[in-house]
Interface confidence: low
């Protein structure tokens, strides 16, 4: 028996359902009574779901997994993982045994988009050219850790005097806070880009500092 999975990671958004695809080629006359199917975590060998002795043995993993029972006889051994969490990320191995056995691993990459950044300024009044200001860009509830980029109004990257911190909450999602310290020019626009490297998603925020009231 030959097991096939995608070698490209399955990307799943937090709180959505993901399908880890696994298939095999059944011989003519194959029946489910012959099938032993086991899904387990690749590294720890923890059992996730199994089908043995002609029946679905159910989820052994937080009751959030399911097979596709009507498709098993056609060789579809895929696993459905419901309400994906950050802690589900990792490699899963699909073992199929009929007479001989084969197995293959599929990786699950969990992702969550970052919110539109909010921009704050300190100090936020009586600003003059030459003043040192601190601009904070905050974006929330993303995964995995973000890449943060600052640019000025001409699109020139600002790399000096940037401090970025990322903190995970109880769900494993990251809040990112990036602080730019900059000396004000006569007028200036400062933009922050928060990129999710897995989703290739960019979230933008900017602040324009003029002689007039600030615009965000």
């Amino acid at each position: 028996v030959e097991v096939q999975v995608s070698e490209d990671p399955v990307v799943a958004l937090v709180d959505t359902d993901a399908t880890l695809r696994c298939s095999f080629s059944p011989e003519p006359g194959f029946s489910l009574a012959q099938l032993n199917l086991i899904w387990q975590l690749t590294d720890t060998k923890q059992l996730v779901h199994s089908f043995t002795e002609g029946r679905d043995q159910g989820s052994a993993y937080s009751n959030r997994t399911a097979l596709f029972p009507d498709l098993l006889v056609q060789g579809n051994a895929s696993l459905r993982l419901q309400r994906v969490r950050v802690t589900d990320e990792g490699s899963y191995t699909c073992f199929v045994s009929i007479q001989d056995f084969d197995s293959a691993a599929v990786s699950l990459q969990v992702a969550a988009p970052y919110s539109k950044p909010s921009m704050t300024l300190e100090p936020n009044k009586d600003l003059r050219p030459g003043n040192m200001v601190t601009i904070t860009c905050s974006s929330y509830q993303g995964y995995p850790e973000a890449e943060v980029f600052w640019k000025d109004g001409q699109g020139v990257p600002l790399t000096g005097n940037v401090t970025t911190s990322q903190m995970a909450n109880e769900r494993g999602l990251f809040d990112v806070h990036s602080v730019l310290r900059v000396v004000l020019g006569a007028n200036g626009t400062y933009s922050c880009l928060v990129r999710n490297p897995v989703l290739q998603q960019d979230a933008h925020g900017s602040v324009t500092i003029t002689g007039q009231p600030l615009t965000f």
């Epitope: 490699s91 001989d100 691993a105």
Partner: antibody, heavy 116, light 111 residues
Framework: EVQLLESGGGLVQPGGSLRLSCAAS????????MSWVRQAPGKGLEWVSG????????YYADSVKGRFTISRDNSKNTLYLQMNSLRAEDTAVYYC?????????WGQGTLVTVSS | QSVLTQPPSASGTPGQRVTISCTGS????????VTWYQQLPGTAPKLLIY???HRPSGVPDRFSGSKSGTSASLAISGLRSEDEADYYC???????????FGGGTKLTVLG
Amino acid sequence: EVQLLESGGGLVQPGGSLRLSCAASGFTFSSYGMSWVRQAPGKGLEWVSGIYSGGSSKYYADSVKGRFTISRDNSKNTLYLQMNSLRAEDTAVYYCAKNRLRFDYWGQGTLVTVSS
Amino acid sequence: QSVLTQPPSASGTPGQRVTISCTGSSSNIGSNSVTWYQQLPGTAPKLLIYSDSHRPSGVPDRFSGSKSGTSASLAISGLRSEDEADYYCGTWDASLNAYVFGGGTKLTVLG
């Protein structure tokens, strides 16, 4: 840390045989397909062969079909390439690589020289 | 003659953006995802881009990949001297039942 270490290369006469080995560590070897890729001196990459995780299916480039045999021993975390009827054009650095369709880790390679 | 066609060479100066193309057919690029590999002088190849446009962790975001129809391309922005290397595209060919590489592109960083 994933590591792939090839061995078994050397100088062999045309028509001779060699067996290359690739010792794998740092990942669950038995769950991944594996491949051999070669590079002749000063030339580009050429895929040689690939094998499924359980060893049930094997694929070969036309240039080596019938002469080379890929195999694996999952109990030893080792991939093999048996090369028979070697020709001068088989001279190359042979790399083993993790996966069959997307080579995410490579060994440092072992040099095979076929010359009389 | 490689199944996938790449320009043999490309060049740029530090800070520039360089694009490397990879042209195939419906049986390879047209039906399977493309992977890009970087081979620095005297070293083994390294995975650079997978699934047409995804970067493994550790690969700078200056590297990006894209695919349209039966062609793929690798773009390198903000070119650096350490990017001087050979770049290969690769994918599975369903007709040949084999993995195929492009002939490779030697990238030179000038100046």
